[in-house]
Each structure stands twice: as C-alpha cells, then as structure tokens.
C-alpha cells in the first residue's frame, strides 16, 4: 500500500541495503524510490542528541514483508518509498539547503553572482550532481561567491556537514532544465573505448541506454549484442564516462552498439520504463515467486503488482498442461537488471512496469493514427483540448494542449477581452464539438497566466498557461504531450501535424470534428522572406506548404503543432498567427515552444 507521510522520531530496525547522505528526509524518500531495491528508509536529522557524524544519513532498507519493526528514536525520520504508489514521481529537487556543505569530488571551482547562477552552472555541466556555494557573507574572503561543482559515484553526497554562510543544492537536469544536448542516436558497430564505471546485463541497446540515463555517473555506453563473438560479454551493457564528457575513442566493431545518456531529454522520452517483451530470452536473477499465468502479458502484470519484482521470465505452458497456464518467474537482483541473459530456451522475458510512473506520462505510446483524411479519430490527439468561453454564449474559443495534470498550454491572444478565468471551460477527450452538452463535464479555469512580454500575436510571446481548478485523470483519450527538450533545439522535425476545430477557409465556421493536417516546418529565414513586414524571431517557428492549401485558421489558435520524434510526440508549436489561411507562400506562424520551456517550468513548478 502507498504510505507517503513521514514517521517522526521513528527508526526502522534492520533490512539495511546501503547508507547514503541526503540533506532532508524528503530527498531520502526520493533516493529510496529510485533505488532498485529500497522499500523503506530511516533518515537522521541534525539534533543535539545525535552524533554529528550520523546527521543527514539516509539508510535504505528492504524487507520481504515490505515493512520492518519500528523503534522510537529522537531525530530519526522514517518512511516508505514511492514504489508502492501509483502517482507520478519525479527526482527533480529545486530546494536550496542553507548552511549545509554537501561533500563530493570538487572538480570545478568558479565565481558566481548567486546560488541560482551556481545551480544553473551545475545543471549545464555534464558531470555535476550537486554544488555548494559560499555566499558573500562567508568568513573566508577568498572563498566568497565561489561555486563548487561536485560529483560522486552515487550522485548523492559522500557526507553532509553544517557550515555557516554556504548553500547547497542539486543539479536540475532531472527537472528538464538543462541546456545540454540531447543525443538520442544509437551508433551501430561502434565501441566507445573509455573507462567503465559499471556494467549490467541488458536485452538490447535501448534498455542499456535507459540504464545509463538513470545511472548517476554514466555519460555514454557500449552494448554488446547477443551476436557478439565473445560469449561471456553477450548482452553486456558497459556504462562509461570520460573527463571531457564525450567518448575519446570510437572503435568500429561489428555487433556492438553505443550511445549517450539521455539525461538531458529524460523528461520527454521514457528512461525507466522498459515495456518490451523479449522472446526466446530468459532473465536470470534471484527468484521471488513462481506463479501460474495465462500469458506473458499477465506475467508482466503480476511482476508490476509485486512491489519487489524487477523483471520476469514466462515459460509458456506445454500443450494441455495446467489449464493452458504457463509459469511466471518473478525475479529481482541487487541492481534491478538480470544477472545473466540466456537465449534459445523458449522463455519470454520483460521488466516491471512499476517504474513507468517515474517517466513523464507524455511519453506513453498512443494508439496508431489513421493516415490520410482530414478528420481525426477518437484518441488520436489526446492532449488536444477545446477551450470554451461562456460569453456572450457558450462556444469554442481556442485550442490548447494538456502538458500536465493541471496545466493547459495555449496562446495568449485567445484571452483578448476575457475578463475572468471563471467564464472559461476546458473540455478534454473531445472529438466532435456536438458531443458537448450542458451536462458534459469540463475543467474550470483557476488562473490564466499570460507571458508578461506579450503584446500582440505578431510580435511574439504568444503563449499562455491555464491552471485548472481540478486535476486531469489521464486516460487514453486525455493525456499530456511532451514539451520539446532544450537539448533538442537542433532536431529537424519531419512529422508535424496541426490540429483544431477552426475554420477550413477564411470565411467559414468552427468545424464539428477535430481536423488534422500534416504540415512541413519552414526555416525562419524562408519564413522571414514571406513576411517582410514582420520580424520572425527565433521564438517563432513556421510551417506550411509553399503552394498553400493546408494550414491552421481561425479557431485553431492556441492549439498544438505536434511533431513525432523517436516515437514520442512533442509540442513543438502553438498556433499563433498568419496572413489569411493556407495562402500560397504564407506559412502559419507558431510560438516556438522550446524557447519557452524555462518559462513554462517556472510557472508550473512554482510553489
């Protein structure tokens, strides 16, 4: 069961896996959640009754019964991992810890104007896990305003001590705030010849890449496939690092694949969720349980529901045996990966889906779309919402996109003359406007947040957030779209679609059925030539056919320009403005969402 509250002055006895240092019990709980085996923890807060060397210790614990005996102890704070919970989990920690020195390898020292600048530096440095900043009140003159970037093998401090006039904090890479490049490519027939920090077994290069991504020290990896000549190294995933942050040597080797940590793009692609099945593959590990199951899908469900299960192997039933049920072997290991992978024994293996909640919901695969045709089908664009105004009468006002369970991203120009958020209604999971009746459920709008530099659509900053009064429960017909990664600024999107209920020609009316059009992106240089009277800035993105014919139009405003990249849909643009609709050599102009990721995160993550 899910227990989120912390138990004050309580210590769990026994079950120790390892001890790390964390600045707070809250962060200890996050570390426990992300650890492959931790189910419970005990944190020791600073206290005069405690030995200072034990302050800030976070003892990660495991238990076959999922609980441990409780003992009263002053300054101890205990709790459970969020593994047992169904809610979305994030490792993002924006907290700044005053008068704490988080120890690690100090590999970079520089002057910074503020702790925020130091944190930004850490976030944009490939090696940095956390930092300590000496404030201008720090006693030692030569250390004032010094920003120390630090890393450790575990990503958590090796020790934490009290130190006046310093502040410490963590890299915000896991908050999607890094400007580091997001390199998704996997390079075939390539070995990166750099130092290995760890090695695990993986069924394919994609899983290896995901493991590298959530390993604190891994910057890139090499994977030896099952056809690799050296049998003992088959399915071996080597996690690597280098001083420069890049591979120093690439060696051409057949049957090996290499790639990079996806740390800078982890909010927009799945890195924890290994959802594939591996046929004719057996995962070896510590056996947790053997249960009968009808199929490998049922076996995966059983593993997902067993909190300690990390991976499984299913052996299909022999004909007419055991009512057609096969054997489902639920397994675990010290690091969450199989200890060995065997092929050719007829098993079907896979991983728990419990970790999927650590990934952004927006990375979930949606149903295959119908190609061709202009009318959408239900569930094809589950992030698309219709924003209605009730003034003078209820009607579709603009489109919008679900980007979080309480947040809609749309265009600022939609709110001209809207005096209050109360008069707005957001409908999600809608295909036809005619579905919306008086009793159709909607989300009320609590707040309209318009970019403070917005003046008019044509001059940019045409972006707004709607904070909903209640949260959206994600389903197949209503779920979020990923924001583009700042590290993806140079990605060339080739599969982009604009959707909306807007006009189909300049003098028309709102369409009943959600319309879709595949539209190519146009370079800003090309777009600028088509709009000589306007300034097309880097904060705008253009899309359209040279000959016209397909475009967004009145009523589509605020809706998404959705682009598919590496099987994940990204909100690349917000429908903003254009000269007429679908005119020859007049592309549509969209708000370039990647340029506003910081603004979006600042507003949506504000306490």
């Amino acid at each position: 069961e899910c227990v989120t509250q912390l138990l004050k002055d309580t210590c769990f006895e026994g079950g120790d896996i390892t001890t790390v240092f964390t600045p707070s019990a809250k962060y200890c709980q996050v570390v426990c959640t992300y650890h492959p085996r931790c189910l419970l923890f005990t944190f020791t807060a600073e206290s005069p009754s405690e030995d200072p060397t034990r302050w800030f210790t976070c003892v990660l614990k495991d238990s076959v019964t999922e609980t441990l005996p409780r003992v009263n102890r002053t300054a101890a704070i205990s709790g459970y991992s969020f593994k047992q919970c169904s809610h979305q989990i994030s490792a993002c920690n924006k907290d700044i810890y005053v008068d704490l020195d988080m120890k690690g390898i100090n590999y970079n020292s520089s002057v910074a104007k503020s702790a925020q600048e130091c944190q930004e530096r850490c976030t944009d440095d490939v090696h940095c896990h956390f930092f300590t900043y000496a404030t201008r009140q720090f006693p030692s003159l030569e250390h004032r305003n010094i920003c120390l970037l630090k890393h450790t093998q575990t990503g958590t401090p090796t020790r934490i001590t009290k130190l006046d006039k310093v502040v410490s904090g963590f890299s915000l890479k896991s908050c999607a705030l890094s400007n580091l490049a997001c390199i998704r490519d996997i390079f075939p027939n390539t070995v990166f010849a750099d130092s290995n920090i760890d090695s695990v077994m993986a069924p394919d290069a994609f899983v290896c890449g995901r493991i590298c991504t959530h390993h604190p020290g891994c910057l890139f990896f090499t994977f030896f496939s099952q056809e690799w000549p050296k049998e003992s190294q088959r399915n071996l995933c080597l996690l690597k690092t280098s001083e420069s942050g890049l591979p120093s040597t690439r060696i051409k080797k057949s049957k090996a694949l290499s790639g990079f940590s996806l740390q800078s793009c982890r909010h927009s692609i799945p890195v924890f969720c290994h959802s594939s099945f591996y046929h004719d593959t057996d995962f070896l590990g510590e056996e947790l349980d053997i249960v009968a199951a009808k199929s490998h899908e049922a076996c995966q469900k059983l593993c997902t529901n067993a909190v300690r299960c990390q991976f499984f192997t299913y052996t299909p039933a022999q004909a007419s045996c055991n009512e057609g049920k096969g054997k489902c072997y639920l397994k675990l290991s010290s690091n969450g990966s199989p200890t060995k992978i065997l092929h050719g024994r007829g098993g079907i293996s896979g991983y728990t889906l419990r970790l999927c909640k650590m990934d952004n919901e927006c990375t979930t695969k949606i149903k295959p779309r119908i190609v061709g045709g202009t009318a959408s089908v239900r569930g094809e664009w589950p992030w698309q919402v219709t924003l209605h105004t009730t003034s003078p009468t209820q009607r579709h006002l603009c489109g919008g996109s679900i980007i979080g369970n309480q947040w809609i991203l749309t265009a600022a120009h939609c709110f001209y003359g809207v005096e209050s958020p109360k008069i707005l209604r957001v409908y999600s999971g809608i295909l036809n406007q005619s579905e919306i009746k008086e009793d159709t459920s909607f989300f009320g709008v609590q707040e309209i947040i318009i970019h403070d530099q917005y003046k008019m659509a044509e001059s940019g900053y045409d972006i707004a957030l709607l904070k909903l009064e209640t949260t959206v429960n994600y389903t197949d017909s209503q779920r979020p779209i990923c924001l583009p990664s700042k590290g993806d600024r140079n990605v060339i999107y080739t599969d982009c679609w604009v959707t909306g209920w807007g006009y189909r020609k300049l003098r028309d009316k709102i369409q009943n059925t959600l319309q879709k059009a595949k539209i190519p992106l146009v370079t800003n240089e090309e777009c600028q030539k088509r709009y000589r009277g306007h300034k097309i800035t880097h904060k705008m993105i253009c899309a359209g056919y040279r000959e016209g014919g397909k475009d967004a139009c009145k009523g589509d405003s605020g809706g998404p320009l959705s682009c598919k990249h590496n099987e994940v849909w990204h909100l690349v643009g917000i429908t903003s403005w254009g000269e007429g609709c679908a005119q020859r050599e007049r592309p549509g102009v969209y708000t370039n969402v990647v340029e506003y990721v910081d603004w979006i995160l600042e507003k949506t993550q504000a306490v």
Epitope: T390, S391, P392, T393, Q394, E419, P421, E438, K509, I510
Partner: antibody, heavy 117, light 107 residues
Framework: QVQLVQSGSELKKPGASVKLSCKAS????????MHWVRQAPGQGLEWIGN????????NYDEKFRTRVTLTADTSTSTAYMELSSLRSEDTAVYYC??????????WGQGTTVTVSS | DIVMTQSPSSLSASVGDRVTITCKAS??????VSWFQQKPGQAPKLLIY???NRYTGVPDRFSGSGSGTDFTLTISSLQAEDVATYHC?????????FGQGTKLEIK
Amino acid sequence: QVQLVQSGSELKKPGASVKLSCKASGYTFTRYWMHWVRQAPGQGLEWIGNIYPDSDSTNYDEKFRTRVTLTADTSTSTAYMELSSLRSEDTAVYYCTRMGFYAMDYWGQGTTVTVSS
Amino acid sequence: DIVMTQSPSSLSASVGDRVTITCKASENVVTYVSWFQQKPGQAPKLLIYGASNRYTGVPDRFSGSGSGTDFTLTISSLQAEDVATYHCGQSYSYPLTFGQGTKLEIK
C-alpha cells in the same frame, strides 16, 4: 426546475433610481450569465447587460453603461439591476433571463417600471 | 452594433398555413441566432437556438434555418395557439441585439 422570480412593479419619478431583483433557483447560480432585457410598451426587446455571478464580470450596452449597475449576491442566488437618473422613456417591462448553454432559455416574469411625474 | 432586421413586422395567416418569418443580420453572426415566442402579457419563451436547434418541448412544427446573415423561422402548419409576437436575437457579439418583432395573427 429552473425559476427566475422578479420583484414587483415600481412607480418612480424622473431623476430617481430603481433597483430590481431576480431570485434564481433550480440551478447553480454562479455558473450562468444573467442578462437583463427590457421591453417598452408596444416595442421590441432591448438588451441592457449581463453579469457572471461567480466573478462579477459584467458587460453593458453602451447606451446604459453610465446609468446601470448589475450586481449579484451568490449567497441568496439573487441578481440585481439598478437604473439611475430615470426618465419617462425608461418606462418598460424589465426581464432577467439566464443565458443557458446556447441561448436565453429561462426568463423571469418581468417587472414593470413606470416613470412618471 | 449588429442590427437585426426582422420581416414582416406583422402577418396574418390561416390555421394550417405554412408561415415564414425572416431575420437579416447587418454582419456575419455565424449561427448564433435564437428565436423567441412572446404571448401578450407574458415573458418571451425560447423556441430555436443556434439558428436551427429546436429547444426542449417546442413542437416540431417550428423550425429554424440559416447561417451568416440570413435566418428564417418556419411554422409548418399554423395552430391557433401560435398567435404571438416572434423575436429573433443574435448572441454572436456584444451588445446582444434583437429584431423589432413580428406580430402573427390568425385570419
């Protein structure tokens, strides 16, 4: 069922003010715009303005902007219309009407206001 | 302001007749037009909304059509109880405006 009950007839002198009430029941008062419309003897309908009780957002016809104040009391689900500086041409039946999902679907019975010296 | 011009201002027809009342908007109001029936001494009642949607409980002899600037209310077979004044109104933009009304009588 939805009901809009308006206050009784008023006889006023020119220059005076009048405040009419409209008590709503049978629906969530805060979630619908309340409009006010008047009809002079033998004439058509004339829109005065509207109010959204949940936020006190209002819109007025320019003709009435300086003389009309629309308010709403959510605790009693009552909308009010105050018209000041009355003149003889303000003699009319004043209706409150709820803007339903797409149109003015429920109307009060009307309040007759007579302005005469 | 959008001007709604209703015609005729009055008409007389026999029971069973097909009756048509038109309303012309001075600019495009899409389909944001409603029709109301008002009997003497009573408040108006909604008949048609969204130009062509019959309101709950309204007999199916009443129908509406049109979009843009030209709208029509049709009574397919006039009944004695249909004697009333009929108003069209637009709710496309502020200020909301109404036609001057059409008074319908039985011959």
